[in-house]
């Protein structure tokens, strides 16, 4: 049966026993800046082109053992959430991966900047259709990272990022705090904000909307046919990147402002239990859970 | 995210180092009164001191970025400091990434075309 997260973003008309927009997002390229990925996993084979871009810091610790499946875990799962054959949102989207996070899931602002510059140069050398850039990472507030995101957004690229898993104001993190970026918080099957250990999803006025981000089934790098459940605002951002890819595939001329407006318009409203957020943040945090457009767009979204 | 907000730095640390006029006899001294700023991550464990993104003013060309980077290296060498230019940015933001001692920040902030300098910091999978 359909995983809860795909059911949650699917308009009621399509809630049959399976989620089947078979070619959603086929005109769009989604760039993923993350860990290395297992690109020939059965769920994503042929859908992800691994670029030669790599800019990562060395792993911490003298006894760190680099195990391929662990190195690939985060990125493989997210690629699966965006475009996986069986558990992906935009099953028709093609992806390109850039490695900016090491085997411990750590990267640098500078490496991310160079990755964003690589995307811009690729766009200039070979202009394609609409581009979505997924940044499932967060660091402290960074003027330069936000500025780079702003420039890329002004070049017509849609950037989607994780709000952060720090149970804190997203405005204190980057790229979550960049105004031009679509910043995504995480909710669970009960439409509650996601708790992650002692922390949880970020919140506040720098968040644009929420999306499923707990117990999300996706490709596991443990084996070529394995699936695993992961949680976090990265998973939530991957859902929105997939939805954005489908919207842009249906309407390639959408501007960032129009896309953002559509994402908000089609979201489920006032379903999140706001009591989880600090009192002073409740009014500032959008009570929106991302969803695909309804059946009026059948011919566009479910090709 | 969330368009329409004012740009707010929150806890972000901004160290403004005023430029002094006795620049090293540069042909292209900065315009009088402009102030380049230094930024670093407010979360101490995430800081990566020793690597800095030098961001130049918006219309700076690649050749000027390269020249500014070389100038920094030359001036640092005169003071007995080794520096390494790790990357020259162009396409999105003009500037360069440099590995150097924090002692050179004041010098770097006085270079022509410099808008601000940010210390590198960590980002994490979410």
């Amino acid at each position: 049966s359909i995983p809860w997260n795909l059911e949650r973003i699917t308009p009621p008309r399509y809630r049959a026993d399976e989620y089947q927009p078979p070619d959603g997002g086929s005109l769009v390229e989604v760039y993923l800046l993350d860990t290395s990925i297992q690109s020939d996993h059965r769920e994503i084979e042929g859908r992800v082109m691994v670029t030669d871009f790599e800019n990562v810091p060395e792993e911490d610790g003298t006894r760190f053992h680099r195990q391929a499946s662990k190195c690939d875990s985060h990125g493989t799962h997210l690629a699966g959430v965006v475009s996986g054959r069986d558990a992906g949102v935009a099953k028709g989207a093609s992806m390109r991966s850039l490695r900016v996070l090491n085997c411990q899931g750590k990267g640098t602002v500078s490496g991310t900047l160079i990755g964003l510059e690589f995307i811009r140069k690729s766009q200039l050398v070979q202009p394609v259709g609409p581009l979505v850039v997924l940044l499932p990472l967060a660091g402290g507030y960074s003027r330069v990272l936000n500025a780079a995101c702003q420039r890329l957004a002004r070049a017509g690229v849609v950037l989607v990022t994780a709000a952060g898993n720090f149970r804190d104001d997203a405005c204190l993190y980057s790229p979550a705090s960049a105004p031009e970026v679509i910043t995504v918080g995480a909710t669970n099957a009960q439409d509650q904000p996601v708790t992650l250990g002692t922390l949880g999803t970020n919140f506040g006025r720098c968040v644009d909307l929420f999306a499923p981000g707990e117990d999300i089934i996706g490709a596991s790098s443990d084996c070529s046919t394995c699936f695993v459940s992961q949680s976090g605002t990265s998973q939530a951002a991957a859902h929105v990147a997939g939805i954005a890819a489908m919207m842009l595939s249906a309407e390639p001329e959408l501007t960032l402002a129009e896309l953002r407006q559509r994402l908000i318009h089609f979201s489920a409203k006032d379903v999140i239990n706001e009591a989880w957020f600090p009192e002073d943040q409740r009014v500032l945090t959008p009570n929106l859970v991302a969803a695909l457009p309804p059946s009026t767009h059948e011919n566009l979204y479910f090709q | 995210g969330a368009m329409g907000q004012e740009d707010e730095d929150g806890d972000y640390e901004e160290l403004v180092l005023a430029l002094r006029s006795e620049e090293d006899g540069l042909a292209e001294a900065p315009e009088h009164g402009t102030t380049a700023t230094f930024h670093r991550c407010a979360k101490d464990p995430w800081r990566l001191p020793g690597t800095y993104v030098v961001v130049l003013k918006e219309e700076t060309h690649l050749s000027q970025s390269e020249r500014t980077a070389r100038r920094l290296q030359a001036q640092a060498a005169r003071r007995g400091y080794l520096t390494k230019i790790l990357h020259v940015f162009h396409g999105l933001l003009p500037g360069f990434l440099v590995k150097m001692s924090g002692d050179l920040l004041e010098l770097a902030l006085k270079l022509p075309h410099v808008d601000y300098i940010e210390e590198d910091s960590s980002v994490f999978a979410q």
Partner: antibody
Amino acid sequence: QIQLVQSGAEVKKPGASVKVSCKASGYPLTSYGISWVRQAPGQGLEWMGWISAYNGNTNYAQKVQGSVTMTTDTSTSTVYMELRSLRSDDTAVYYCARGYGMDVWGQGTTVTVSS
Amino acid sequence: QSALTQPASVSGSPGQSITISCTGTSSDVGGYNSVSWYQQYPGKPPKLKIYEVSNRPSGVSNRFSGSKSGNTASLTISGLQAEDEADYFCSSYTSTSMVFGGGTKLTVL
């Protein structure tokens, strides 16, 4: 263009081993693994297993586990399938195909096991 | 894994439509969006005609279409032509492997 080119026909005695090669070209190799499929004379298709061109990981069908070994040589973009302890019912055409999706196939390699 | 169940043979006249079924279980056909259909001429390798239930690779005639309901997938060939006479195989993912149907011989009368 995208191509999978296999090695030539083999005749083997029962108990022997055979190693079939498959050279891939025309696509980003790490984006797909290679599946091996065999077809006995007049019979249907049987999936034997898969190997990753990315990291060399394998996934063998239960039926051939223990008698098959798949390997990859990334320097030459070539994948190998070795079948040991051959029996007469291993007589078949052996195909390599791109990925689990098997959207591109090699021309096939006939392996005859006969005493 | 036992093979997916296909009819051993089907036939049709030129211009007609035929449908070949492929029945599995909830662990293969019913559980995944990844049913493929292959055409094979004697002495030749199989050729992909439909992937992921209903998608056609570029270059494949739109006379070929695929669908799925529950644990059964179907291949329909409309406007039957002499060159469609061949063997047709379905395949599906299982949790850890791949499984093929036994094959259907299509005869164009």
